[in-house]
């Protein structure tokens, strides 16, 4: 069964700056990942940034560099800033549509207790999804 | 079938405002950021920016911040892009192309003439 | 922003022969993570808009004939049309699809002798 995991990470320098990275943790060939928070994408949630493999990457404030790390797992840079920028609660979530497995779907936030420039490992975050 | 049907063309004059739609059909509006596109008569082609219907969130290109301003209603699946302080310049033929570029607009002819 | 140099601006060849057209942009447009290529190719005929043939520089998108090949990396990038067919005339455009704002080059605009 394919799993999805989720780390978020809150930066040392800056302290409303956040890293999310999330991973595939599947043999199917990825098609498309999205991120969003307060939530699903499509249930309540925003999307941050949707990354194709091939076609390229979108990004919306406040995303500021969304990359892929690896051919399954990406990374996304958020500004902390300004009134759309996120606390230290907000959930953040990844999903991956991918071929033959469909798309899967985990969230992620901050550790309640996580210092500045630590978080928690990326083990794989709860499958909320799977259409 | 997606479909991307744009507004008719424009006549305007310089120092005027213009505001164009692109009424998308086919596909769930909210899924797929929309873009925006520039072609000027004989011209390459210049990316304007792109707008998320999930939440209104946009990306301009620098060299069109100020001069266009680009909305979305999601209750009629439609992108609009405002353009302001025309001036001859600015005539052209504006695309909307949905993420990707795979799908296209027709095009808005927009005329800046006095 | 990354700048989109295409050449030749324009060319004209006989049904049937191949051409190549050339791309290269002022950055990579490789995503080192995944190691892609964020390049995109289209073809677009008088009084049209646009049409993708082509993204990450080498993948035909649905529907378009495979005479139409993607091929580069990096900076350099080429669009070869194998065997040119009378509907092929129209101005071939590429596109760097890697960095905000998505530059486009000037195109290479292809005639039929």
């Known amino acids: 069964t394919p799993e999805v995991w989720v780390q978020v990470r809150m930066e040392a320098t800056e302290l409303s700056s956040f890293t999310i990275r999330c991973g595939f943790l599947g043999s199917g060939s990825i098609s498309l990942v999205t991120v969003s928070w307060g939530g699903p994408n499509g249930a309540g949630g925003t999307t941050l940034a949707v990354l194709h493999p091939e076609r390229g990457i979108r990004q919306w404030a406040p995303a500021r560099q969304a990359r892929w790390e690896t051919q399954s797992s990406i990374s996304l840079i958020l500004e902390g800033s300004g009134a759309s920028s996120p606390c230290a609660n907000t959930t953040f979530c990844c999903k991956f549509a991918s071929f033959p497995e469909g798309s899967w779907e985990a969230c992620g936030s901050l550790p309640p207790s996580s210092d500045p420039g630590l978080s928690a490992p990326p083990t794989p975050a709860p499958i909320l999804r799977a259409d | 079938e997606v479909q991307l049907q744009q507004s008719g063309p424009e006549l305007v004059k310089p120092g005027a405002s213009v505001k164009m739609s692109c009424k998308a059909s086919?596909?769930?509006?909210?899924?797929?950021?929309m873009n925006w596109v520039k072609q000027s008569h004989g011209k390459s082609l210049e990316w304007i920016g792109d707008?998320?219907?999930?939440?209104?969130?946009?990306n301009y290109n620098q060299k069109f911040k100020g001069k266009a301003t680009l909305t979305v209603d999601r209750s009629s699946s439609t992108a609009y892009m405002e353009l302001r302080s025309l001036t001859s310049e600015d005539s052209a033929v504006y695309y909307c192309?949905?993420?990707?570029?795979?799908?296209w607009g027709q095009g808005t002819l927009v005329t800046v003439s006095a | 922003d990354i700048v989109m140099t295409q050449s030749p601006s324009s060319l004209s060849v006989s049904e049937g022969e191949k051409v190549t057209m050339s791309c290269k942009s002022s950055?990579?447009?490789?995503?080192?993570?995944?190691?892609?290529?964020?390049l995109a190719w289209y073809q677009q005929k008088a009084g049209q808009p646009p049409k993708l043939l082509i993204y990450?520089?080498?993948t035909r998108e649905s529907g378009v004939p495979d005479r139409f090949t993607g091929s580069g990396s990096g900076t350099d990038f080429t669009l070869t049309i194998s065997s040119v067919q009378a509907e092929d005339l129209a101005v071939y455009y590429c596109?760097?699809?890697?960095?905000?704002?998505?530059?486009f080059g000037s195109g290479t605009k292809l005639e039929i002798k």
């Open positions: 707008i998320n219907p999930n939440n209104g969130g946009t």
């Open positions: 596109q760097n699809a890697h960095s905000s704002p998505f530059t």
């Open positions: 990450g520089a080498s």
């Open positions: 950055q990579s447009l490789l995503s080192s993570g995944n190691q892609k290529n964020f």
């Open positions: 086919g596909y769930t509006f909210t899924d797929y950021s």
């Open positions: 192309a949905r993420v990707w570029f795979a799908y």
